[in-house]
């Protein structure tokens, strides 16, 4: 396994509809035609997997049908969006990549971005 | 849209030097990330080094780590290849490449790079 660079925003507020996006990029070594890119969360020490997609150089990348994240990738950048976000799922959201294919192996992991999530106020009742 | 041109080819004996230089018209450099790529008569194009937006961050693959030096002044809009004990093997067409990213990080595949150069050739032979 060799360290790759992966760079990430440090912040990212969401939308008042609960959407986050960011951008995820590396720096590839060399002509990688299959990579992996993973969204990790971590919140009090835990860290869980929030989705996860493989993709092949030059092809979108597909999340599972009910991922809560979306993507696109163009060369070494990676646009992910995280849809459904709530004010508890505020956190440090990682980004990780791993270039699956032709060997070697690369992992990149970044620092994170911060998502902060604020959910809306309800709109007060209108005597109209 | 972003053109580029590569310039400083030529013949050279081993052990000598180059600077090629890499000149972009059409959109300001420091928006990419650039690569330089080499190509030798009946072989696959191979990456020889990359740099950043910013200048901070490079790659070299091993072949030319330590010979070659990539650099870059945005005020000119240039990318510079500085290749020092040069060798036989080290003959092929230079071509510089750029992909436009956000950060400050760049790639040594050629698969990332959108817009390419025509290319300078650089011989090393005595």
């Known amino acids: 396994c060799k360290a790759m660079h992966v760079a990430q925003p440090a912040v990212v507020l969401a939308s008042s509809r609960g959407i986050a996006s960011f951008v995820c990029e590396y720096a590839s070594p060399g002509k990688a035609t299959e990579v992996r890119v993973t969204v990790l969360r971590q919140a009090d020490s835990q860290v869980t997997e929030v989705c996860a997609a493989t993709y092949m150089m030059g092809n979108e990348l597909t999340f599972l049908d009910d991922s809560i994240c979306t993507g696109t990738s163009s060369g070494n950048q990676v646009n992910l969006t995280i849809q459904g976000l709530r004010a508890m799922d505020t956190g440090l959201y990682i980004c990780k990549v791993e270039l699956m294919y032709p060997p070697p192996y690369y992992l990149g992991i970044g620092n994170g971005t911060q998502i902060y999530v604020i959910d809306p106020e309800p709109c007060p009742d209108s005597d109209f | 849209e972003v053109q580029l041109v590569e310039s400083g080819g030529g013949l050279v004996q081993p052990g000598g030097s180059l600077r090629l230089s890499c000149a972009a018209s059409?959109?300001?450099?420091?928006?990419?990330?650039v690569g330089w790529f080499r190509q030798a008569p009946g072989k696959e194009r191979e990456e020889v080094a990359c740099?950043?937006?910013?200048?901070?961050?490079?790659d070299y693959p091993g072949s030319v780590k330590g010979r070659f030096t990539i650099s870059r002044d945005n005020s000119k809009n240039t990318v510079y290849l500085q290749m020092n004990s040069l060798r036989a093997e080290d003959t092929a067409v230079y071509y510089c490449?750029?992909?436009?990213?956000?950060?400050?990080?760049?790639?040594?595949?050629?698969?990332?790079?959108?817009?390419w150069g025509q290319g300078t050739q650089v011989t090393v032979s005595s």
């Open positions: 490449a750029a992909e436009r990213l956000v950060f400050h990080l760049c790639s040594l595949s050629e698969y990332d790079y959108d817009t």
């Open positions: 059409g959109d300001t450099l420091e928006s990419f990330a």
């Open positions: 740099i950043g937006r910013t200048g901070e961050f490079t």
